[in-house]
Amino acid sequence: KFSKQSWGLENEALIVRCPRQGKPSYTVDWYYSQTNKSIPTQERNRVFASGQLLKFLPAEVADSGIYTCIVRSPTFNRTGYANVTIYKKQSDCNVPDYLMYSTVSGSEKNSKIYCPTIDLYNWTAPLEWFKNCQALQGSRYRAHKSFLVIDNVMTEDAGDYTCKFIHNENGANYSVTATRSFTVKDEQGFSLFPVIGAPAQNEIKEVEIGKNANLTCSACFGKGTQFLAAVLWQLNGTKITDFGEPRIQQEEGQNQSFSNGLACLDMVLRIADVKEEDLLLQYDCLALNLHGLRRHTVRLSRKNPIDHHSIYC
């Protein structure tokens, strides 16, 4: 249940997250599963543990194997396994199937290709993109943040796309590449002004102090794949990343396509360990596309814990 496959190329950086996640304050210990030998935390080591992350800087073929992470949570030490495979660099252009990340599909209206696993790394823009080993050039290709946008997509744009970026660790730079296939769908669709399905406008969400809370911003943008459609959360009119509260994070949901063909997106706002001051904030769910922007505001209110079983009746 808590085992994850990870792979990389020799002489590149590879960062693996423990599949068993806990709260940020929890200690995480990493071990080589075969030898039960502890992985050091000192950054001077080529392979070292850094909380929930295991870093290979750079990776070697001999690093392949199963790694155990133990989350030191209260009551139980919870165990996860990372199955790591490091491959030799290919001399030819072909990227073998075992190095490929999940295939993504695009169409004339939506041609975003996300760079896989990039969120684990300390990288700076711009990303370099390659198709079938050739560097992408021309105005049709735009590297934007962690994804590639292709304008006026054609069936010929299908193929294997590789992103290349530099991971920086204490001033040292390490190369990382990741490849995924892109397929092109011929899809008749349309785009409309965003419709926010959740939350309702001016919704009051009940939360318990000290517990975790999730708010989902869900919006639909038309039929078929969409070009430039996004949902996001703001706190008091500020982007989550700029707000600077590590307890509050947003997590992209899956692209949704309902049976009626509507293209929808959702973004989950995760609030860890809800505090009194969180009740004072204004939470805005924003949905935007080429037609414009729609905003729904949510506020939090204190929910009294359910009296599951009153001892004294």
Epitope: K1, K23, S25, P74, H308
Partner: antibody, heavy 122, light 111 residues
């Protein structure tokens, strides 16, 4: 109403086996860590085994290798398979709810069943 | 394993008077998340145990405010400000830092 109901207790001979069941209702069973806790006649409470939401299992040395805890989330059920039973295993066995293993929230062992009695005797 | 030691073993009380039970652990029950994983339970005669206090000092739902939990590190106390007849039974402290371990229990009875 949040509830745990144990069943399966009874009289068994030393060396025999017994399977206890616990039916949960009124909460999202699959996200909680679950425990079996026992109490020998006139004695203190003793933790017997636990299972987390991933299905990882935990036992004290006194029952390791003899007892097996398991869960069936689709049926909101917890089980304890007890083999090679000894006279010292005679006790009331309680099924109890632990922390929320999904959110890592802990509010004590806040729900207990009524207990089921296991007697090991020849 | 963490060992839990409770005192006294028996506590005769007078209704309306305060009562105090002590619990000591063989190692600190403070976790890296800042909480002390120490609970208090009451087992009334012929009943299942019931939660009174969790994480050292938090009263469980439905527990009267005459019950107060305090302490830190290895030393914890349960206080009953004014004992009532319905409070009789065996009180257990329990650590939940590393698996679960119960104290030996304190039997509270009316004088």
């Amino acid at each position: 109403e949040v509830q745990l109901v144990e069943s399966g207790g009874g009289l068994v001979q030393p060396g025999g086996s017994l399977r206890l069941s616990c039916a949960a209702s009124g909460f999202t069973f699959s996200t909680y860590d679950m425990h079996w806790i026992r109490q020998a006649p006139g004695k203190n409470l003793e933790w017997v085994s636990a299972i987390d939401l991933a299905g990882d299992t935990y036992y004290p040395g006194s029952v390791k290798g003899r007892f097996t805890i398991s869960r069936e989330d689709a049926k909101n059920s917890l089980y304890l398979q007890m083999n090679s039973l000894r006279a010292g295993d005679t006790a009331v066995y309680y099924c109890a709810r632990g922390g929320d293993g999904y959110n890592y929230d802990y509010y004590g062992i806040d729900v207990w069943g009524q207990g089921t009695t296991v007697t090991v005797s020849s | 394993d963490i060992v839990m030691t409770q005192s006294p073993l028996s506590l005769p009380v007078t209704p309306g008077e305060p009562a105090s039970i002590s619990c000591r652990s063989s190692q600190s029950l403070l976790h890296s998340d800042g909480y002390h994983y120490l609970d208090w339970y009451l087992q009334k005669p012929g009943q299942s145990p019931q939660l009174l206090i969790y994480l050292g000092s938090n009263r469980a739902s439905g527990v009267p405010d005459r019950f107060t939990g305090s302490g830190s590190g290895t030393d914890f106390t349960l206080k009953i400000s004014r004992v009532e007849a319905e409070d009789v039974g065996v009180y257990y402290c329990m650590q939940a830092l590393q698996i679960l371990t119960f104290g030996g229990g304190t039997k509270v009875e009316i004088k």
